[in-house]
C-alpha cells in the first residue's frame, strides 16, 4: 500500500482502518509538456545503442498507450556505422504506475499497477563468462 | 482524462457525466518483480554513459520515493577508460504517473500526476552547429 | 513470397575481385538485416557479414579488410565487394535474411540457394 | 571468436528412433540483456541451410514438434523425439551473441 504521513489526522497504513480504496481525481496535474516521446528528442536514433519504439496499447489501462524501446542491435554502434559486439546494447528499465480498469470495462473503477517498461537503450561494458 | 473504452455501460469521456473523480484500490498489482533500481543491475557502471542515482522522496506523493539519474559525464567513457568529448552522455527521460495527495495529508484523496523523470543515460553522437 | 537469390559468382584468378549479389523479393531491406555466410566444398557455415535494417553493419575481422557489404534499397538487393581473394576464399555464398527487426531473434529465416565463388589460376 | 563444438559428428539413428546433439560453446552465450541467442539450422542434402530452432528452445514456424531445443549458458542440446527418412542431412548449431557469428562443425544424421 501507500505509506502515509505520519501525523495524528492519518492512520497507519498497518492500521486495518487504513483505506484500500482511495479517491483519485483524474484531472492530470502536469508538471512538464507531455511529449509523445518519438517526436521529444531523436536520441533513439543518434545513440550509439539506437532503439526503435513500439506501441503497447491496452484500453483496459491508463495511459491505454505506452512506448516500449527495444534495443536494434546487439552490439553498439561505432562512429563508421559498423556493429561492435566487444559492447552491449541493453535496455534501462523502469518501473511505472498504471491504472487497470477493475472490474473490466468499468469507467469509475481502477486498480492501481506496476509494470516494468523499457525506456531507452545504453551501451553497456559486458560480462565475459569463459568456460573453463 | 481517460479514454472509456465505447461500449453501452461506459460513459463518453467527454460527456459531462463522465466521473472526474474514481475509485483506486490501492493493493497494487505487481506484473513483474520489484527491484530496486540500484539493485536491479549495474548498468549504471557498466555503460559507456555511466549515471549516478539520485533518491527524490516525497511524502505526499505515491510512488513516495523515485530515483533520479544524472549522466556523471558530459562526454562517453572509452574502453580505455577515458572521457571522450566528441560523443555526450544525455539522460533519457521517461513520462511517469504519479499519485499527488489532495488535500494536503489526506489519506484517501489524491490527484493524478504526470512528472518527467531521468530512467538512465545513454551515448549520442551530437549535433554540430557550424557559424556560417 | 520471401525469396533471395545470389548471383556474381564465378572463377576468378588469385588477387582478383568479384562482386556478389543477392537480390531480395517479398519483403524489405529496410525492415531486415541480410547475412553473407559462405561454405567452402565439403566444410560447415562459416558467418561473413551482415548489413542491418538500419543500414549499420558488422563483419567477421577476418575478412572485413577485404569485403564490403552494401546494399542499394531501391533496387532491393544486398552486395558483397570481395578483393584480394585467395584460393581459401572458393566457397557457395549464401545470403540468408535475418528475423523482422520488430522480432529481435538474430536468427537467419530464410537462404538464398547460393552462388558458387572459385578462386584458382 | 566463440568456438562452437559439436557432438557427436555422425549419428546413424534408426526412422522412429530418437536422436540428440549437443553443440558447447568456449564462452557464454547470454547476452548483457539476459537472452541467449543460439539457434540450430539443418541443411538438407543438396540444400541451403533452413531455420529449425531460435533463441534455444522457440521452433520456427513450419517446423515439426518433433524438434525441440534446450540448454542455458554453454550447453546446448536439439532432441528429435522420433526420427523421420526426411530429416537426413546436416545440423548446424549456431551463435549470434557474440560477432563474429559462428557455426558448429555439423553433424550428421544419416539413416540406419
Known amino acids: 500500500g501507500i505509506a502515509i504521513p505520519r501525523n495524528s489526522g492519518c492512520p497507519n497504513s498497518e492500521d486495518k482502518n487504513f483505506p484500500r480504496t482511495v479517491m483519485v481525481n483524474l484531472n492530470i496535474h502536469n508538471r512538464n509538456t507531455s511529449t509523445n516521446p518519438k517526436r521529444s528528442s531523436d536520441y533513439y536514433n543518434r545513440s550509439t545503442s539506437p532503439w526503435n519504439l513500439h506501441r503497447n496499447e491496452d484500453p483496459e489501462r491508463y495511459p491505454s498507450v505506452i512506448w516500449e524501446a527495444k534495443c536494434r542491435h546487439l552490439g553498439c554502434v561505432k562512429a563508421d556505422g559498423n556493429v561492435d559486439y566487444h559492447m552491449n546494447s541493453v535496455p534501462i528499465q523502469q518501473e511505472i504506475l498504471v491504472l487497470r480498469r477493475e472490474p473490466r470495462h468499468c469507467p469509475n473503477s481502477f486498480r492501481l499497477e506496476k509494470i516494468l517498461v523499457s525506456v531507452g537503450c545504453t551501451c553497456v561494458t559486458p560480462i565475459v563468462h569463459h568456460v573453463a | 482524462g481517460i479514454a472509456i473504452p465505447r461500449n453501452s455501460g461506459c460513459p463518453n469521456s467527454e460527456d459531462k457525466n463522465f466521473p472526474r473523480t474514481v475509485m483506486v484500490n490501492l493493493n497494487i498489482h505487481n506484473r513483474n518483480t520489484s527491484t530496486n533500481p540500484k539493485r536491479s543491475s549495474d548498468y549504471y557502471n557498466r555503460s559507456t554513459s555511466p549515471w549516478n542515482l539520485h533518491r527524490n522522496e516525497d511524502p505526499e506523493r505515491y510512488p513516495s520515493v523515485i530515483w533520479e539519474a544524472k549522466c556523471r559525464h558530459l562526454g562517453c567513457v572509452k574502453a580505455d577508460g577515458n572521457v571522450d568529448y566528441h560523443m555526450n552522455s544525455v539522460p533519457i527521460q521517461q513520462e511517469i504517473l504519479v499519485l499527488r495527495r489532495e488535500p494536503r495529508h489526506c489519506p484517501n484523496s489524491f490527484r493524478l500526476e504526470k512528472i518527467l523523470v531521468s530512467v538512465g543515460c545513454t551515448c549520442v553522437t551530437p549535433i554540430v552547429h557550424h557559424v556560417a | 513470397e520471401v525469396q533471395l537469390v545470389e548471383s556474381g559468382g564465378g572463377l576468378v584468378q588469385p588477387g582478383g575481385s568479384l562482386r556478389l549479389s543477392c537480390a531480395a523479393s517479398?519483403?524489405?531491406?529496410?525492415?531486415?538485416?541480410v547475412h553473407w555466410v559462405r561454405q567452402a566444398p565439403g566444410k560447415g557455415l562459416e558467418w561473413v557479414s551482415v548489413?542491418?535494417?538500419?543500414?549499420?553493419?558488422t563483419y567477421n575481422s577476418a575478412l572485413k579488410s577485404r569485403f564490403t557489404i552494401s546494399r542499394d534499397n531501391s533496387k532491393n538487393t544486398l552486395y558483397l565487394q570481395m578483393n584480394s581473394l585467395r584460393a581459401e576464399d572458393t566457397a557457395v555464398y549464401y545470403c540468408?535474411?535475418?528475423?523482422?527487426?520488430?522480432?529481435?531473434?538474430?536468427?537467419?529465416?530464410?537462404w538464398g540457394q547460393g552462388t558458387t565463388v572459385t578462386v584458382s589460376s | 571468436d566463440i568456438v562452437m563444438t559439436q557432438s557427436p559428428l555422425s549419428l546413424p539413428v534408426t526412422p522412429g528412433e530418437p536422436a540428440s546433439i549437443s553443440c558447447r560453446s568456449s564462452?557464454?552465450?547470454?547476452?548483457?540483456?539476459?537472452?541467449?541467442?543460439f539457434h540450430w539450422y539443418l541443411q538438407k542434402p543438396g540444400q541451403s541451410p533452413q531455420l529449425l530452432i531460435y533463441?534455444?528452445?522457440n521452433r520456427f514456424s513450419g517446423v515439426p514438434d518433433r524438434f525441440s531445443g534446450s540448454g542455458s549458458g554453454t550447453d546446448f542440446t536439439l532432441k528429435i523425439s522420433r526420427v523421420e527418412a526426411e530429416d537426413v542431412g546436416v545440423y548446424y548449431c549456431?551463435?549470434?551473441?557474440?560477432?563474429?557469428?559462428?557455426f558448429g562443425q555439423g553433424t550428421k544424421l544419416e539413416i540406419k
Open positions: 533463441k534455444v528452445s
Open positions: 548489413i542491418w535494417s538500419d543500414g549499420t553493419t
Open positions: 540468408a535474411r535475418d528475423t523482422h527487426y520488430r522480432l529481435y531473434y538474430y536468427a537467419m529465416d530464410y
Open positions: 564462452q557464454s552465450l547470454v547476452h548483457s540483456n539476459g537472452d541467449t541467442y
Open positions: 517479398g519483403f524489405s531491406l529496410d525492415s531486415y538485416g
Open positions: 549456431s551463435q549470434t551473441t557474440h560477432a563474429p557469428f559462428t
